[in-house]
């Protein structure tokens, strides 16, 4: 739902977006996902920040916690206990890195309408969550995990190694937790809550990377985070599981790494629970093209656990990096030994398949010329799947629905029909046992949120329409977005063109490139979206292209591996190749053309400005990775191997942005950063600076005291006021 | 109030049998391990089964091992001990006791008296 | 099996006195899961301290446990009329839980 295009004759009403109303929000969406309890139940906070639980089948609604309460204690989250006894309240929210943050944590008794007194929670906790059944806690303070067997009994200490940059136990170091769960937590309650199963990261030999934080003290404090760059030592992973019944019986037992892994340095990428008694563990070679899913089970004459060679899964690239972003998870079915999983087919599509025994003996589920892209729920007779299949458009999404309880298996698509126009990129949320679910979609039209019936797929109700922005929008001129296909070369170019509103293909328009462009990414999607560049091409006039080239996702892996030990190589090249093919269109003024990226896309807008191709007259490269050897070791080293001579060093070296700081000399080039940059480090910034100033060539820069990778709150409007302003002046457009 | 109160305990001769019972109120019973400890007369304590708040594991200590069974009902809120082939050693008072994480003991009933005699 | 050994067998002080109780264990109890208990004629015992050093609800701020390893100590701090009883030390750490022997604690 495009807010409909009004004739010219009401023009005049209509106005432009601006720069202000993308600052404030004014045109930012809600989305709706239940917070499933049951099969039929969810809560919800409501508007006057009620918890109020829902009941599908009944009808009716009440409030489990009041306002009152949770203002009582400032709290901003909430969690409720399976049996329903207790809600811990979150407050004191103290954001750490991209997931993780401490907080304090209030446990309020909804029998007697009172917080538990006793034994409190210490302060600050780093993670806290409920068991799957009754009212047990875990929580991690101080890098130690503590069990609770109640809210208000005394803490059972289960680990005690734990020190800040050191030993992290249920919870992830920072590149775990950035590049390889990606989570705040690492510790999973078995379905019953009888086990307890943690990784413990050991960080005592990574080197740390240190930079200032200023603060407004008299001197500026140090970071310091244990981060193993490209090549350097890596943290060392254990996982254990306790029994949370009697944890001190025989305390913490080690799961074992299966021996191909353990030959060399490896890494733990997921842990999925099959039963009480049976996990699920999925291990990578640091070369990260091999990895073994390992099924154990638990021995009760030894209280151990046996993880037999025979249950063991090998999966394997031949032409890249292991899975897609990440390795695929397995979803287990109902008899707890064969599940379904998304890897390459024969052809170098991901696909869902399905194991029973062996890997090699894996029943293929779906297939075609597109990609599966994430398995929501199996159930007895149905499995819930998501891909990009429906009229060959990879940037959209789907839900389908397979039989399984049928043969053959029928698919039907649950949602390709049901609002065309408006919705063609879905997500999904299932109650247990998918008896309910809740769509939410996220364009291209205004994004909607609705409860089906997960029998018929009929649909229940409206959760979220966005009427008040949809009112919003009917005076403004929104620009016209488009998404086509380039061929060229055997390669599919997809782009996103957000076009002016009165666009006119005889005209000449500036062109701006926005790029992103790192392995496994997608920039062109059919979403909504009201941001810097809708008022970009609304008030001002541009066109704005975002180009999926190669080492982008979800259209088969020749695509996708092509970039595999050679970033910063074609990711440009099809940048550059799109935008030549969009200068033969004929409205591109070619001597007004830019491009603009964050983090990977600040790296290729970056090498793309010097390239030396006389494309661009200007760019901007925000918080930018500038040579591999700075960056992560984790995300590098999957698409790079190791920085080392006898593997992939010469790349690296001829990969970097310093290297072409000559080219430099003819654009006009932007360079920004945020000095308290976590993830990708101010280091990156820095040299490329130094570089530029080496080679004599002019550039502006703009730095963020203290702030990190997403230069956020007042910095987000300096950012892109300062951006507009660039880019007006390379445009020559008048302020 | 926690309440933990112990009975069946008696006289008994050795190589007999008895069934002890413990009943608990003021807390959620299913939420919890359980254990009995022994304490001979005069002497020190001595741990000698536990259980899972579900009761799906139970554990022994190697004297009782083969002889005592340890069971428990949620839905009565009753925690028992069953006692076959009892010795003269068996002789002291049997104490209930809310067991911590398979850790400490805390609170305990006031304990039942088995004598192991002929 | 761990064995304590707890020391001394019987301790006489005064109301007033500070009281240290010793446990030593015959092998390292591990991540300090000592627990102490005090048990009065004719009634059960009675939790005081768990994990070597936590009090556990209700006990006055007298008594306080220290130690890890193979040495674990009980304190308290000002002896009162009602502390005069026997205590236990009991470790978790290691699978048959055992108890200490006792110390009696009694008015000079």
């Known amino acids: 739902l495009r807010p409909s295009r009004v004739h010219n004759s009401e023009e005049n009403t209509m106005r432009a977006l601006t720069l202000k109303d993308i600052l404030n929000g004014t045109f930012s969406y809600k989305t709706f996902f239940p917070n499933w309890i049951s099969g039929q139940e969810y809560l919800h906070q409501s508007a006057d920040n009620n918890i109020v639980l829902y009941n599908i089948e009944t009808g009716q609604s009440y409030t489990i916690l009041s306002n009152r309460t949770m203002k009582s204690v400032n709290a901003s989250n909430y969690g409720l206990s399976p049996d329903r006894q207790f809600v811990y309240l979150e407050s004191d929210y103290s954001k750490l890195w991209r997931y993780s943050y401490t907080a304090t944590y209030y446990i309020y008794d909804l029998s007697n309408g009172e917080f538990v007194r006793g034994n409190e929670l210490p302060r600050p906790i780093q993670y806290l969550c409920w068991s799957p059944v009754g009212s047990k806690l875990a929580y991690v303070y101080q890098n130690n995990i503590y069990l609770k067997q109640r809210p208000g009994d005394p803490p059972f200490q289960i680990t005690f190694n734990g020190r800040e940059n050191k030993i992290f136990n249920g919870i992830p170091d920072w590149v775990y937790e950035e590049e390889m769960l990606p989570t705040k937590y690492a510790l999973w309650w078995s379905p019953n809550g009888k086990f307890l199963a943690y990784a413990e990261f050991n960080d005592k030999d990574i080197p740390v990377i240190a930079y200032s934080y200023y603060g407004d003290e008299q001197y500026p404090r140090t970071i310091n985070i244990p981060y193993p760059k490209a090549g350097a030592k890596n943290p060392v992973v254990r996982i254990f599981i306790i029994d949370t019944t009697y944890p001190a019986y025989v305390g913490p037992q080690e799961v074992p790494v299966p021996a191909m892994i353990a030959s060399s340095d490896y890494y733990f990428s997921w842990l999925t629970w099959v039963t009480d008694e049976r996990v699920c563990l999925q291990w990578l070679k640091r070369v990260q093209n091999v990895s073994v899913l390992s099924i154990c089970d638990f021995r009760e004459d030894w209280q151990t656990w046996d993880c037999p060679k025979t249950q063991e899964h090998i999966e394997e690239s031949r032409t890249g990096w292991a899975g897609g972003f990440f390795v695929s998870r397995p979803v287990f079915s109902y008899d707890a030994i064969s599940y379904y999983k998304i890897f390459s087919d024969k052809d170098g599509y991901k696909h869902i398949h399905y194991i029973k025994d062996t890997v090699e003996n894996a029943i293929q589920i779906t297939s075609g010329k597109w990609e599966a892209i994430n398995i929501f729920r199996v159930t007895q007779d149905s499995l819930f799947y998501s891909s990009n299949e429906f009229e060959e458009y990879p940037g959209r999404r789907n839900i389908y629905r397979i039989s399984i309880g049928s043969y053959p298996p029928s698919k039907k698509c649950v949602t390709c029909h049901l609002r065309k126009e408006r919705c063609q990129y879905y997500t999904a949320s299932f109650s247990d046992y998918a008896k309910y679910y809740a769509l939410v979609c996220y364009g291209p039209g205004i994004p909607i949120s609705t409860l089906h019936d997960g029998r018929t797929d009929q649909e229940i109700k409206i959760l979220e329409e966005n009427k008040e922005l949809e009112n919003a929008l009917k005076n403004i001129q929104l620009p016209k977005e488009e998404i086509k296909k380039l061929e060229v070369d055997e390669i599919t170019l997809w782009y996103k063109m957000i076009l002016p509103p009165q666009f006119d293909r005889s005209k000449k328009y500036p062109l701006l490139i926005q790029v992103y462009g790192g392995p496994c990414s997608q920039s062109v999607r059919s979403v909504f979206a009201v941001n810097w560049i809708s008022y970009l091409a609304s008030k001002e006039g541009m066109v704005i292209a975002l180009v999926d080239g190669r080492g982008t996702a979800f259209q088969g892996d020749k695509l996708l591996y092509a970039v595999y030990r050679k970033l910063g190589v074609y990711e440009v090249e099809d940048q550059i190749t799109a935008v030549r093919k969009f200068i033969e269109m004929g409205f591109i003024d070619e001597k007004r053309i830019a491009i603009w990226g964050w983090s990977y896309g600040g790296y290729v807008s970056s090498l793309a400005l010097a390239s030396g191709t006389g494309l661009f007259k200007c760019g901007i490269a925000v918080a930018p990775v500038s040579s591999w050897e700075y960056y992560a070791s984790v995300y590098t080293e999957r698409f790079m191997g190791l920085p080392t001579k006898d593997d992939n060093l010469e790349h690296y070296k001829n990969s970097t942005v310093m290297a072409r700081a000559e080219y430099f000399r003819n654009v006009d080039y932007l360079l920004i950063h945020g000095t308290a940059d976590d993830n990708v480090h101010f280091q990156n910034s820095a040299q490329i600076a130094k570089a530029l100033v080496n080679a004599q060539v002019d550039f502006q820069a703009m730095w963020y005291s203290d702030q990190n990778h997403g230069l956020s709150g007042l910095s987000t409007n300096h950012l892109y006021t300062h951006m507009t302003h660039f880019l007006k002046q390379c445009f020559s457009l008048s302020d | 109030e926690v309440q933990l109160l112990e009975s069946g305990g008696g006289l008994v001769q050795p190589g007999g049998s008895l069934r002890l019972s413990c009943a608990a109120s003021g807390f959620t019973f299913s939420s919890y391990a359980m254990s009995w400890v022994r304490q001979a007369p005069g002497k020190g304590l001595e741990w000698v089964s536990g259980i899972s708040e579900g009761g799906g594991s139970t554990y022994y200590a190697d004297s009782v091992k083969g002889r005592f069974t340890i069971s428990r009902d949620n839905s009565k809120n009753t925690l028992y001990l069953q006692m076959n082939s009892l010795r003269a050693e068996d002789t002291a008072v049997y104490y209930c006791?809310?067991?911590?994480?398979?850790?400490?003991?805390?609170?305990w009933g006031r304990g039942t008296l088995v004598t192991v005699s002929s | 099996e761990i064995v304590l050994t707890q020391s001394p067998g019987t301790l006489s002080l005064s109301p007033g006195e500070r009281a240290t109780l010793s446990c030593r264990a015959s092998q390292s109890v591990s991540s300090s899961y000592l627990a102490w208990y005090q048990q009065k004629p004719g009634q059960a015992p009675r939790l005081l301290i768990y994990?070597?050093?936590s009090r556990a609800t209700g006990i006055p701020d007298r008594f306080s446990g220290s130690g890890s390893g193979t040495d674990f100590t009980l304190t308290i701090s000002r002896l009162e009329p009602e502390d005069f009883a026997v205590y236990y030390c009991q470790q978790y750490g290691s699978s048959p839980r055992t108890f200490g022997q006792g110390t009696r604690l009694e008015i000079k």
């Open positions: 006791a809310k067991d911590y994480y398979g850790g400490w003991f805390d609170p």
């Open positions: 994990g070597a050093s």
